[in-house]
């Protein structure tokens, strides 16, 4: 489930960068793009063994603010 638009202001960012719900903020180009253009995280199927050296992303069990996906101030995340 994607989040709605969020204002994004980092300590290095000059201004807020809102993205509409279908868009994600691409840090490399520093603007909003369709989320489908970015490799957004996909859940790993249960019991699947991913081929080395693939390693999927997951938040740690205990996530501090700003460290895990749930705490990210980036818009349009899963």
């Amino acid at each position: 489930m994607r989040r709605g638009p969020r204002s994004l202001r980092g300590r290095d960012a000059p201004a807020p960068t809102p993205c509409v719900p279908a868009e994600c903020f691409d840090l490399l180009v520093r603007h909003c793009v369709a989320c489908g253009l970015l490799r957004t995280p996909r859940p790993k199927p249960a019991g699947a063994s991913s081929p080395a050296p693939r390693t999927a992303l997951q938040p740690q069990e205990s996530v501090g603010a700003g460290a895990g996906e749930a705490a990210l101030p980036l818009p349009g995340l899963l």
Epitope: R11, D12, L28, V29, L38, T40, R54, L57, A65, L72
Partner: antibody, heavy 117, light 111 residues
Framework: VQLQESGPGLVKPSQTLSLTCTVS????????WNWIRQHPGKGLEYIGY???????YYNPSLKSRVTISRDTSKNQFSLKLSSVTAADTAVYYC????????????WGQGTLVTVSS | EIVLTQSPATLSLSPGERATLSCRAS??????????LNWFQQKPGQAPRLLIY???NRATGIPARFSGSGSGTDFTLTISSLEPEDFAVYYC?????????FGGGTKVEIK
């Protein structure tokens, strides 16, 4: 998702090194697709990327000699490094980062390219 | 470009011991409230393997003995109790801005 590098393992000095990375299980029209190299016994050096839109970025240290391109019909992206010398002997990896952390979680197994006459 | 300095270059430890690896950036790798600092493990003849992303988050399948901490310019990778398969080279990498850069690596070897 798998990445597989391919290309000649031996290149002569002053020639152009050409490598291809074939991606399966994901589309190169999504995300960033990178080349990284590692000189024997040394650390990792970032070469550059081609993005979902086809735009490219090259490490300034190699920019004058590097070209990264793609063939979306084959789901491949390629590296060309011109005017090679022995200092370009390295294992070349293709890799891709996930969003939103840009952490490279997809890697090819790497291919050793030796520059020698 | 952002320069990453890892220390020590080599760490000689025994299985079961705690390993503490350091990575220092020449400037902050924080942006938008995130530390864009990742850790990789590499064994001979293999591609690097992502261990930790965004400073403190374990990648899928990475054992709980691996943990990352830090923000800004100073980061630490800790292996709480070394297993035989943990002896390898570890690299930090920043993904805040291109060119993405790697530290010089820390080799964790058996004492």
């Amino acid at each position: 998702v798998q990445l597989q590098e391919s290309g000649p393992g031996l290149v002569k000095p002053s020639q152009t090194l050409s490598l291809t990375c074939t991606v399966s299980g994901d589309s190169i029209t999504s995300g960033y697709w990178n080349w990284i190299r590692q000189h024997p016994g040394k650390g990792l050096e970032y070469i550059g990327y081609i993005s979902y839109s086809g735009s490219t970025y090259y490490n300034p240290s190699l920019k004058s000699r590097v070209t990264i391109s793609r063939d979306t019909s084959k789901n491949q992206f390629s590296l060309k490094l011109s005017s090679v010398t022995a200092a370009d002997t390295a294992v070349y990896y293709c890799a891709s980062p996930n969003y939103p952390f840009y952490a490279m979680d997809y890697w090819g197994q790497g291919t050793l390219v030796t520059v020698s006459s | 470009e952002i320069v990453l300095t890892q220390s020590p270059a080599t760490l000689s430890l025994s299985p079961g011991e705690r390993a503490t690896l350091s990575c220092r950036a020449s400037e902050s790798v924080d942006n938008y409230g995130i530390s864009f600092l990742n850790w990789f493990q590499q064994k001979p003849g293999q591609a690097p393997r992502l261990l930790i992303y965004a400073a403190s988050n374990r990648a899928t399948g990475i054992p709980a003995r691996f943990s990352g901490s830090g923000s800004g310019t100073d980061f630490t990778l800790t292996i709480s109790s070394l297993e035989p398969e943990d002896f390898a080279v570890y690299y930090c990498q920043q993904s805040k801005e291109v060119p993405w850069t790697f530290g010089g690596g820390t080799k964790v070897e058996i004492k």
